[in-house]
């Protein structure tokens, strides 16, 4: 009767850190002679396992107990598998050499075990500084470590699956693998409250995808607007100047008030305003004396935002003519307020 | 240093019992089958009974077949013999063997004598 | 009766080789190892497998097999050496462990 090695599993799946059974049994108990195990096969083909004693196995053992002189069980289970165990599995046996070494007589049709590894919760970074509204700007989201190699990644922003992403796999063993995906996103005044999403799909994680978030609040400036207005003229014959600094974000914020050049008084603002869409307001009143002054003063709200080069606002205060019951000013607003970008 | 140190024995008259222990240590029992074998005096050896590593598999040769049990106890790492209906002819050196991989001997204990007599 | 069948005595001068055969077991289904028994003293497995040596044998024991027959090869014999040899087998249709009669090794001189 021919032997027959018989391995019934064409491929075994487990996950990482599991335990995998590999079975082989023989249909005969002769010819005499070892039953051993290889991964892979031909010229670089690598011993695994030999049911011939004297070697160590750590991870290896036995299923059945080979040492009942009737075992046709071949078996051999693999614990705490990793990547790098995935592989074909080969169940040989051996005859007894006369004077030659053993040779090899008959093999099993082998076992593919695959290693079922998670990808590691994507990690989600943005660009290094703030950009404006209206740049566009790079997410990048990375996963680590997972097999096998099929794996579906996807970006929404605000629920929204994003397109406009270049996604690279990549391996340096061929065991597991790693995943980058970066995606480009324009920006708009409205994203402060938007946050992008990496999903990441794969079989291991049951149809449970694994989220990576990155939010705009963290990547986004908008850059104030400056205003000011002046209330009437008090029976104190002061100037009360008003600087209102509309829809800004993040909150860092300098605000100084210049007499003709020359700074008066420097705000750091504590309190704000917060608006619906995220951004905030911040008002600055400024007190002027108009008998301190005899000629036209021009007053300039300054303002220095996340670091960003200063912004300004003008505000011309004239003067009338000095009577005998005592000087008074008039004001005039200087309409064309420019931005200082330089 | 595989150490195997047999003890039980003495003088039994024919059809009496007889209980063989066999402490082992200096490898790990449990995985190694084991095996009995005995010697007459000014005969050659005999193999007389085997057992699997696990315990569940035993063999004998048709001389001992339905009269000798060999068992173990792994927690113990202890192998036994339990000898009954004994014969003259049982009468001998019983050394208790660990097997190889392929159930040849590597390590044999110092002995134990067995005398049937009445 | 013993099932393997080796010569009951053999001499050999110290320094010379001595070779021991056991035959009578089926080659597709039988290991063989030798045991060498001073008397007195317990049995020391010399080969094992057919021709492994256990590592506290000195090389000079070897063993080799060719068809049903397997020889040990006792190379540079010493004095010490003069023992009762054991074939040993593992019949694997049987499960059984049959053994030779043992040969007497004289050492001569």
């Known amino acids: 009767k021919e032997l027959k090695v018989t391995q019934a599993d064409k491929s075994v799946s487990v996950a990482a850190g599991d335990s995998a059974t590999l079975n082989c049994t023989v249909s005969s108990l002769t010819p005499v002679g070892p039953i051993k195990w290889f991964k892979g096969e031909g010229q670089n083909r690598s011993p695994i396992y030999s049911f011939i004693g004297g070697e160590h196995f750590p991870r290896i053992t036995n299923v059945s107990d080979a040492t009942k002189r009737n075992n046709m069980d071949f078996s051999i289970c693999i614990s705490n598998v990793t990547p790098e165990d995935a592989g074909t599995y080969y169940c040989v046996k051996f005859q007894k050499g006369i004077v030659e070494p053993d040779t090899e007589i008959k093999s099993g049709g082998g076992t593919t075990l695959y290693v079922l590894a998670k990808p590691s919760s994507p990690e989600v970074s943005g660009p290094d500084s703030r950009g404006s509204p209206g740049q566009t700007v790079n997410f990048t989201c990375k996963s680590y470590g997972f097999s096998p190699r099929n794996i579906t990644l996807k970006w929404l922003k605000d629920g929204k699956e994003l397109s406009h992403l270049e996604t690279t796999i990549s391996s340096k063993s061929n065991v597991s693998y790693n995943i980058s995906s970066t995606v480009s996103v324009k920006l708009s005044p409205e994203d402060i409250h938007s946050r992008v999403i990496c999903e990441v799909a794969h079989v291991t994680l049951e149809g449970r995808p694994l989220n990576g978030t990155a939010n705009f609040s963290n990547i986004i400036r908008v850059s104030p607007t400056l205003k000011i207005t002046q209330q009437p003229l008090t029976p104190a014959s002061q100037v009360n100047l008003t600087c209102q600094v509309q829809k800004f974000y993040p909150k860092a914020l300098q605000l100084n008030w210049l007499e003709n050049g020359n700074l008066s008084r420097t705000d750091k603002p504590e309190h704000f305003t917060d608006n619906r869409d995220g951004t905030y307001n911040y008002t600055s009143l400024f007190l002027v004396n108009s008998s301190a002054h005899r000629e036209d003063v021009v007053f300039t709200c300054q303002v220095e935002h996340d670091s960003q080069p200063a912004i300004t606002e003008n505000h011309t205060v004239r003067a009338f003519a000095h009577s005998s019951s005592g000087g008074s000013m008039e004001t005039i607003p200087d309409n064309n307020a420019y931005y200082n970008w330089n | 240093e595989v150490q195997l140190v047999e003890s039980g024995g003495g003088v039994v008259q024919p059809g009496g019992s007889l209980r063989l222990s066999c402490a082992a240590s200096?490898?790990?029992?449990?995985?190694?089958?084991m095996s009995w074998v005995r010697q007459a005096p000014g005969k050659g050896l005999e193999w007389v009974a085997g057992?699997?590593?696990?315990?569940?598999?035993?063999y004998y040769p048709a001389s001992v077949k339905g009269r000798f049990t060999i068992s173990r106890d792994n927690s113990k790492n202890t192998l036994y013999l339990q000898m009954n209906s004994l014969r003259a002819e049982d009468t001998a050196v019983y050394y208790c063997?660990?097997?190889?991989?392929?159930?040849?001997?590597?390590?044999w204990g110092q002995g134990t004598l067995v005398t049937v007599s009445s | 009766s013993y099932e393997l069948t080796q010569p009951p005595s053999v001499s050999v001068s110290p320094g010379q080789t001595a070779r021991i055969t056991c035959s009578g077991g089926s080659y597709s289904s039988y290991y063989y190892a030798w045991y060498q028994q001073k008397p007195g003293q317990a049995p020391v497995t010399l080969i094992y497998?057919?021709?492994k040596r256990p590592s506290n044998i000195p090389e000079r024991f070897s063993g080799s097999s060719s068809g049903t027959t397997v020889t040990l090869t006792i190379s540079g014999v010493q004095a010490e050496d003069e023992a009762d040899y054991y074939c040993?087998?593992?019949?694997?249709?049987?499960?059984?462990?049959?053994f030779g009669g043992g040969t007497k090794l004289t050492v001569l001189g």
């Open positions: 040993g087998g593992y019949d694997q249709s049987s499960y059984t462990n049959p």
């Open positions: 063997a660990r097997e190889t991989w392929n159930h040849l001997f590597d390590y």
């Open positions: 057992i699997s590593a696990g315990g569940s598999d035993t």
């Open positions: 200096g490898f790990t029992f449990s995985s190694n089958a």
């Open positions: 497998s057919d021709d």
